[in-house]
């Protein structure tokens, strides 16, 4: 058999699902997985950025948090912006459950979110604009 | 609140159509803290194929190109959910999982703890 | 879970060599550096020094710089500390770990470590 069908249990040993669907359990998984937030690298970054927190209702989870740069350029060894740097974000993608409500009925849909995790230093691309 | 178990469409809706994945595909390069990306691979995961940072120099990379070790590279980690099969091997029935990736390096100035 | 497990220390005069071994199994995906440690009687672990797994790059603490080389086998997963010139003062038990920050790890930050391996210097 081809690939996908040795991959897969046999249907009757699945739960049942609706054509067009997939049953999703939101109870998550490693829910106390924490990053360390202690080590302030978002303020001692040559690139640093701080963080906003994006809240809706409807999405689960419900708070997203964004970076975003606080510099163009990079901060140099005297604490200054050297505009010769870029700060640039770095970004990730990362899936949330979306709650729609049509009329007196709910349905939910995954999306995929891209989320600014940071920022780095790099050197900057020539552009050569006039 | 949301409901525990819920059935989601099978079309995955992206909200990323704005950005053009290519734009920052060369930072790892560039970065003065650079990182190479290595294939995680998981048949029962969704999606199977997550891509991991490793900081490639412990210091950082100065304007001469070399090494600055006044200076740290660090990775910069997000946590991201993904869906898990469960039961195992079903082809339409998944948990969220929260998991840590380490997604790109950024260069800090140093917390000197243990280093002379 | 972390595994490490360090080998190769010895008892053996001033101004000789040893070569310390450290095996590691278990590293998350993002592991990037490796780093050596020691404890000497009565004193707290400290540094001694760091290899990016990568690049190779190396770091070491002053009291070491010359003296002792790191180095990595990245197919075996494991690292190495050739310590040559040995003094007296560097008699600890040795230790190696992930370092997940790199040269910006803190020691508190360390939930495991291997048994370590005893060097023992003499004059």
């Known amino acids: 058999g081809s690939e996908g069908e040795t991959f897969f249990q046999k249907p009757e040993s699945c739960p049942p699902v609706p054509g067009g669907s997939m049953k999703l359990d939101i109870g998550i998984i490693n829910e106390n997985q924490r990053v360390s937030m202690s080590r302030n690298i978002e303020s001692r970054s040559t690139s640093p950025w701080d963080y906003t927190v994006t809240w809706d209702p409807n999405r689960y989870p419900s708070e997203v948090v964004q970076a975003q740069c606080r510099n163009l350029g990079c901060i140099n060894a005297q604490g200054k912006e050297d505009i010769s740097m870029n700060s640039v974000p770095i970004q990730q993608e990362t899936l949330v459950v979306r709650r729609k409500h049509q009329g007196s009925s709910v349905s939910f849909q995954l999306e995929k979110v891209l989320v600014t995790v940071g920022c780095t230093c790099v050197t900057p691309v020539i552009h050569h604009v006039q | 609140n949301f409901p525990r178990t819920v059935m989601v469409n099978l079309n995955i809706h992206n909200r990323n159509t704005n950005t053009n994945p290519k734009r920052s595909s060369d930072y790892y390069d560039r970065s003065t803290s650079p990182w190479n990306l290595h294939r995680n691979e998981d048949p029962e995961r969704y999606p199977s194929v997550i891509w991991e940072a490793k900081c490639r120099h412990l210091g950082c990379i100065n304007a001469d190109g070399n090494v600055d070790y006044h200076m740290n590279s660090v990775p910069i980690q997000q946590e991201i959910l993904v869906l898990r099969r469960e039961p195992p091997h079903c082809p339409n029935s998944f948990r969220l999982e929260k998991i840590l990736v380490s997604v790109g390096c950024t260069c800090v100035t140093p917390i000197v703890h243990h280093v002379a | 879970q972390v595994q490490l497990v360090e080998s190769g220390g010895d008892l053996v005069q001033a101004g000789g060599s040893l070569r310390l071994s450290c095996a590691a199994s278990?590293?998350?995906?993002?592991?990037?550096?490796m780093g050596w440690f020691r404890q000497a009687p009565g004193k707290e672990r400290e540094f001694v020094a760091a290899?990016?797994?990568?690049?190779?790059?190396?770091k070491y603490t002053d009291s070491v710089k010359g003296r002792f080389t790191m180095s990595r086998d990245n197919a075996k997963k494991q690292v190495y500390l050739e310590m040559n010139s040995l003094k007296p003062e560097d008699t600890a038990v040795y230790y190696c770990?992930?370092?997940?920050?790199?040269?910006?790890?803190?020691?508190?930050?360390?939930?495991?470590w291997g048994q370590g391996t005893q060097v023992t210097v003499s004059s």
């Open positions: 290899i990016s797994w990568i690049s190779g790059d190396t």
């Open positions: 278990g590293l998350t995906g993002s592991s990037y550096a």
């Open positions: 770990n992930d370092m997940p920050y790199g040269l910006d790890t803190r020691m508190d930050e360390y939930v495991y």
